[in-house]
């Protein structure tokens, strides 16, 4: 074993080095001292460290760790945050386009429905946006509300234009009849299936990205234990106390210390791997009815088909509803 | 190619659907994200090693510090001595992760469960029997996927992978995305989001 170099007789080197960490020299002894009060850098002989210096070294060691962790995660963090932001924005654009397409379909094919239809379509797509961002809204209820709201307008404007505008009473009856008579056929159910599946997947995809960010942010800001702080100090700074400024920790020793300090972090590894592989599985399945871009941008067409379906069955429907909602209509015509 | 109503107008009561194509879709961007994420799959297990390699550690020096003294780099003392009589490393590991780490692990377990539940198994038979009730059967085929876009009077089917997101034509170009080394021209920066 090589003999230790003679300690710095004046602690001058240690002082100039410590000054970079802590301007103000009063903590560094003029000459080596016994250091009996030291708790981390336990001296084998005279030392140029004081208790206060030790505390500063521990603080610096923890800061170093935090900076090293945050530097390590920078690429990963940027990758997930940028994509989370891009997808969130893109999904909002898809919703906006889908709303515009649906409004355009009404304007071009059913201009008499437009004022009210625009309102109902707007509410529906607002709910879609909120759902994607995590709101506690039921997708089936959203679709039912859209068709419940649309049918009275379709009935009074397209199928039975003679009815007065203020048919509030009949509206309630028509909303009920819409479901009981399945006036839109299976289109509402079809839209429910497609929209709920695609939106659920979209929502969980965004949730997963946001959790990924949370995981990285958590490990970036870990507060390391006192024991870990001491181990880091001992590894990185205790050599300074002996005037050994240029000496570096042994590689194997560093690995042992890091495994100890980061045992908790490394436990995340298994679940992190699973997270990436599960996210990959989800993404592989995001097509056709599991792709909100595909589903929402096709909605205008399915809604158009559903109205055509009502028109095709208008004769039968008008008769049935005439009987069903007769009471409401009589009150209306008085 | 993908059809979608960019410019809707009436022509003999038929909804005409224009289409525009762009180089990248949301689905291709998703796949690209996964490929890049997979390069970070060992991120947490590699962290201790990364920190040692990026903090000052003796590489070429003959002597190194083992926490108590200067030793030869390849001696037994290089790893062992520094830990002796100091803190019990085994105890440090046995304490288990701190509460925030346990919480984040629980959240990961939960999202992993959700992701697995939501994942679409390959070749899953999609719900049928959608047209058995109501006045008459709708115009859809028996695979609900085919209903997207409908088949009403002159309607186009809206295909998957719609390439329309030029509106998000912020400069999320090749240079922006970790893992790419191509160079971008200033024009690239402004053309289209989804073309990395």
């Amino acid at each position: 074993q090589p003999p230790p170099p003679p300690p710095d007789a004046t602690c001058h080197q240690v002082r100039s080095f410590f000054q970079r960490l802590q301007p103000g020299l009063k903590w560094v002894p003029e000459t080596p001292v016994p250091g009996s009060d030291l708790q981390v850098c336990l001296p084998k002989g005279p030392t140029c460290c004081s208790r206060k210096m030790e505390e500063k070294y521990q603080l610096t060691a923890r800061l170093n760790m935090e900076q090293l962790l945050q530097s390590a995660s920078m690429e990963l963090k940027f990758l997930i945050i940028q994509n989370a932001a891009v997808f969130q924005e893109a999904f909002e654009i898809v919703v906006r386009h889908a709303k515009n397409y649906t409004n355009a379909m009404f304007k071009n094919n059913y201009p008499s429905l437009t004022p009210q239809a625009f309102e109902f379509v707007g509410e529906f797509f607002t709910d879609v946006s909120l759902y994607i961002l995590g709101s506690d809204i039921n997708v089936d209820d959203m679709v039912n509300e859209l068709f419940d709201s649309l049918f009275p307008v379709i009935y009074t404007q397209l199928m039975n234009p003679g009815l007065p505008d203020s048919a509030l009473d009949i509206n309630e009856c028509l909303r009920g009849a819409r479901r009981d008579l399945k006036v839109f056929g299976n289109f509402p159910k079809l839209i429910m299936t497609q929209v709920s599946k695609s939106l659920q997947v979209t929502r969980i995809f965004l949730q997963a990205l946001n959790l990924g960010i949370e995981v990285i942010n958590t490990t970036d800001h870990l507060k390391f234990s006192k024991d870990c702080g001491r181990m880091l100090t001992r590894m990185w700074y205790c050599s300074y106390c002996q005037g050994l400024m240029m000496v570096k920790p042994c590689g194997g020793y560093c690995n042992v210390v890091m495994q100890g300090c980061m045992a908790g972090v490394v436990e995340i590894d298994k679940y992190w791997r699973e997270y990436i592989l599960s996210l990959e599985e989800l993404v592989n399945g995001m097509y056709r009815i599991y792709d909100m871009e595909n589903v929402l941008l096709g909605l205008f067409s399915t809604i158009h088909d559903s109205i055509q379906y009502v028109q095709k069955n208008a004769g039968k429907l008008t008769t049935t509803i005439g009987k069903l909602c007769a009471h409401s209509q009589q009150r209306q015509y008085r | 190619s993908a059809y979608y109503p960019e410019d809707l107008f009436i022509d003999k009561k038929v909804l005409k659907v224009a289409h525009v194509e762009h180089e990248e879709t949301l689905s291709s961007r998703r796949r690209e994200l996964i490929q890049k994420l997979k390069s970070f799959i060992s991120f947490y297990s590699a962290l201790p090693g990364y920190i040692c390699s990026h903090s000052p550690v003796a590489e070429n020096d003959t002597l190194c510090w083992n926490g108590q003294e200067l030793v030869e780099r390849y001696s037994q003392k290089a790893a062992r001595n520094g830990m002796k009589n100091q803190f019990n490393l085994h105890e440090l590991k046995m304490k288990g992760p701190e509460p925030v780490v346990s919480q984040i692990i629980d959240k990961l377990k939960h999202i992993n469960q959700l992701l697995r539940t939501m994942s679409v198994p390959k070749g899953r038979v999609l719900d049928k029997n959608l047209d058995e009730e109501g006045f008459e059967s709708g115009d859809c085929g028996d695979d609900e996927d085919e209903c997207i876009g409908g088949s009403g009077d002159g309607m186009m089917k809206v295909k998957n992978q719609l390439r329309f997101l030029a509106e998000l034509a912020y400069d999320l170009d090749v240079d922006d995305v970790p893992g790419n080394n191509q160079q971008a021209t200033p024009k690239d920066n402004e053309i289209s989001t989804f073309h990395n």
Epitope: M74, E75, A85, N217 | H54, L172, D176, P178, G179
Partner: antibody, heavy 119, light 112 residues
Framework: EVQLQQSGPELVKPGASVKISCKTS????????MHWVKSSHGNILDWIGY????????FYNQKFKGKATLTVDKSSNTAYMELRSLTSEDSAVYYC????????????WGQGTLVTVSA | DVLMTQTPLSLPVSLGDQASISCRSS???????????LEWYLQKPGQSPKLLIY???NRFSGVPDRFSGSGSGTDFTLKISRVEAEDLGVYYC?????????FGGGTKLDIK
Amino acid sequence: EVQLQQSGPELVKPGASVKISCKTSGFLFTGHYMHWVKSSHGNILDWIGYIYPYNAISFYNQKFKGKATLTVDKSSNTAYMELRSLTSEDSAVYYCARGDYGNYVTAYWGQGTLVTVSA
Amino acid sequence: DVLMTQTPLSLPVSLGDQASISCRSSQSIVHSSGNTYLEWYLQKPGQSPKLLIYKVSNRFSGVPDRFSGSGSGTDFTLKISRVEAEDLGVYYCFQGSHLPWTFGGGTKLDIK
């Protein structure tokens, strides 16, 4: 076109605070991070810190902890930096810059805001 | 913190000459990903810094090919093959691999 427009010059008294802004356009604000740099006399550039507009995650250079506070307003695509307890040492030009991590760290900068601290 | 040391402090050149600026980091600036986030900026009087080179040797868009970067580990160099009048100003190296990110002290390129 990527643009970062900073607020105008500020003359402030010692001990006071100042908040400078950086309005951005031409890119997805939440998809990048914004960082700030101090340019002092004698060609010294000091990196202050960064903030992610997406979720306000930030990191400060230890040297500026307690001196600078970074915030964002997503609705107006604007980043802010507040400097407090100002002294003559804080007189400098402050730049905001858009962060892109993966290839380059920063390619787009604001025009700078001159802060003069004087009694 | 990683200390970035630039030399020379001032570099007088004649137009058309080659110029070379050196930058040394106090420790390796290879990131955990294997990338080296070493960048070169030019700041002209009254202007904000402009990115010239990223990841040691990649020219940013619109930067003339007379600018080139090289190096690895801790030693890096920016070369200008034929100096033009518009190249005058202060050049900074910058490392973005380890937080806090740090700039070199600057090298002033001026006319002899």
